[in-house]
């Protein structure tokens, strides 16, 4: 038949485009928390607000006990901003007395935990020095990148010092992820 030459040799099946509104996503905001005991070489994980104010979880993306739970495999954009605050008087005390309990730097880590893998994986890390800034200092650290995640992966945000985290406004400290 004329025109048969133009027919494809195999049928290509196109998956219907998925609406963005159906994709798993979450935006979590800062919540007050009391500093807890943690192992010396491990940064404590932050708790998050998941339903009040600007915070939400949608389309099977769930938050439980510090962890954002990934409901399906795919490429996700993961982000967090943590705003720290303190006073430089703490820094001068560090220099004078060598006090180990007040840091001269602040660190944020976004960590992935996979049940099948024994060790948590650091996905993103940001560190800033704080001792050269003004008398009452504020320092935001923003992290964000795309990662391939598997269903069941868990994400958390660890910080070097919970007591320095600014919890006063939900737009200062936040954590989120969405399927691309």
């Amino acid at each position: 038949l004329k025109g048969q030459e133009f027919a494809p040799s195999h049928q290509q099946v196109y998956a219907p485009l998925r609406a963005d509104g159906d994709k798993p996503r979450a935006h979590l905001t800062v919540v007050r928390q009391t500093p807890t005991q943690h192992f010396k070489n491990q940064f404590p994980a932050l708790h998050w607000e998941h339903e009040l104010g600007l915070a939400f979880t949608k389309n099977r993306m769930n938050y439980t006990n510090k962890f954002l739970l990934i409901p399906e495999s795919g490429d996700y954009f993961i982000y967090s901003q943590v705003t720290f605050r303190g006073m430089t008087s703490e820094c001068s005390e560090i220099r004078q007395a060598g006090r180990p309990n007040k840091p001269d730097s602040i660190t944020v880590v976004i960590t992935k935990v996979t049940d099948s893998y024994p060790e948590p994986t650091q996905l993103l890390m940001g560190t800033k020095s704080v001792c050269e800034v003004g008398s009452n200092w504020f320092q935001p650290i923003y992290l964000g990148a795309m990662f391939s995640l598997q269903e069941g992966d868990k994400l958390m945000v660890n910080v070097s010092d919970i007591s320095l985290v600014d919890y006063t406004k939900e737009d200062k400290t936040f954590f989120g992820a969405f399927l691309l």
Epitope: V31, Q33, T34, H47, E51, L52, L54
Partner: antibody, heavy 124, light 107 residues
Framework: QVQLVQSGAEVKKPGASVKVSCKVS????????VHWVRQAPGQGLEWMGV???????DYNSKFQGRVTMTRDTSTNTVYMELSSLRSEDTAVYYC??????????????????WGQGTLVTVSS | DIQMTQSPSSVSASVGDRVTITCRAS??????LAWYQQKPGKSPKLLIY???SLQDGVPSRFSGSGSGTDYTLTISSLQPEDFATYFC?????????FGQGTKLEIK
Amino acid sequence: QVQLVQSGAEVKKPGASVKVSCKVSGFSVTRYNVHWVRQAPGQGLEWMGVMWSGANTDYNSKFQGRVTMTRDTSTNTVYMELSSLRSEDTAVYYCARAGRYYVDSNYYWDFPYWGQGTLVTVSS
Amino acid sequence: DIQMTQSPSSVSASVGDRVTITCRASEDIYSGLAWYQQKPGKSPKLLIYGASSLQDGVPSRFSGSGSGTDYTLTISSLQPEDFATYFCQEGLKSPYTFGQGTKLEIK
């Protein structure tokens, strides 16, 4: 900034009802929980109930059947109505926005933001 | 319901004094305790949450401690503006009971 502004003082007769309003700004009543707490003259604070962000309510069993909490999302206002008033209901009534906080892995509620209070006097 | 018992009901002290107020819960509230300050004719003000964490903007002379059923609020060096009534409140479960209050008066 967060503000809760309550309606003015009321004088009511026993058996009547009173409806106190709490107009909020700086947040939405659909995204935060608003509680009601009362304080009789010279007495302590007594939790009455909550209008949850999702529009459901919980009431202190002491007031169950007499208290009704509602809201108007168009004006960002929460209302507390108390019926069958008696002299013991004479008190200052406060609305308050609840805050969540964590200790270890458990969360708890407290009240970082309060309205200015509304004095309700029940007298024959 | 959880019952909250504060003591003393009133205390007289002078500027510069150290004052301690206690609050006992009828069951373990796992450090889910807040402290408030209230001045006459004013709304309560949150001072401490989680038994020991200072709310933003509250002076460091205020501190809280305790666990289980027993909690304390301490003012290390009383200032004139600290004379007020103090309440504890459990945040674990409804009806989120308050203590009956401790009135701090000038000696």
